[in-house]
């Protein structure tokens, strides 16, 4: 039975040219996390594997950095980075848990940094 829940940084905004941290946190389950995938729409950005560590998709290598933790840092943001991002937790034996983050990249310097709530 899947009892876990994923908390995410929710809807966030950042300034063009800047960077942002995408974070998810899985709680309320005893399941063991074996892999976390980060995706943007249908594109795989990165994988954090419990055994093999991080793998960043070649097309994002210059602008994506692993961490902190199981999170992902997006750098050199462009307006085209606006959209939905998903963290997909593969857990044993529960299955997959998916969290959603919406990022808006703003031209203006008044972009609001940070999250709706903090991840532990």
């Amino acid at each position: 039975m899947m009892t876990g829940t994923i908390e995410t940084t929710g809807n966030i905004s950042a300034e063009k040219g800047g960077s942002i941290i995408l974070q998810c946190h899985l709680s309320s389950t005893t399941a063991q996390v074996t892999q976390v995938n980060w995706e943007q729409q249908d594109q795989l950005l990165a994988i954090c594997n419990a055994d093999l560590g991080w793998h960043i998709s070649p097309s994002f290598k210059d602008r994506v950095a692993p961490g902190p933790g199981l999170g992902l840092t997006l750098q050199s943001l462009t307006v085209n980075d606006t959209g939905e991002y998903f963290c997909i937790y593969h857990t044993y034996p529960d299955g997959t848990y998916t969290g959603r983050i919406f990022l808006e990249v703003l031209e203006s310097s008044v972009a609001e940094h940070g999250a709706r709530f903090q991840i532990p």
Epitope: Q32, A50, P93, T96
Partner: antibody, heavy 122, light 107 residues
Amino acid sequence: EVQLVQSGSDLKKPGASVRVSCKASGYTFTSYPMNWVRQAPGHGLEWMGWINTNTGNPTYVQGFTGRFVFSLDTSVNTAYLQISSLKAEDTAVYFCARTGGHTYDSYAFDVWGQGTMVTVSS
Amino acid sequence: DIQLTQSPTFLSASVGDRVTITCRASQVISSSLAWYQQNPGKAPKLLIYAASTLQSGVPSRFSGSGSGTEFTLTISSLQPEDFVTYYCQHLHGYPYNFGQGTKVEIK
């Protein structure tokens, strides 16, 4: 070489306790969940449950609660199964088995210990 | 709980035969099924995972197929060492039960 090596066969009297060990080598112990499987003589395989090798949190399948305890010593890459108040019906081979595969659609028990025969007899 | 039923329970065949073992699930389990081979007095050995993916080092005469509720393990040409017991296991929802086993015997 990835392997799981279990402790040797054990003969116990009813009411006694037994501890079966499962020593892992050749891989990162805390990256893969560990399972315990029972096989009574002449019978099939029964999944007893598993232990989270990151947190040490055990989960027991119905029928294996109470007298059965899964534990870990990550400093020596070893998982343990302890059975207390042994009964004749606990006589079986006990296997530890690693959950391989990293994504939910590829999980399977990819590495097994050789098995430990526990005989309960007065 | 999801139950798995293997058929047949016993199978008599000869070296070189093509044999098929079926595993039926009591509800849909997608492709979350594994097949194991067990020699007497030995630990099970993983043959197939994700219904059809051959585990590294397993001979290509073994293959798996199916999805949903019906799955098959096929041995294209039985070898002397294949006359042992085979189990299916689902990995879709707790608890991860095994089938009752199929013993392949020499005719």
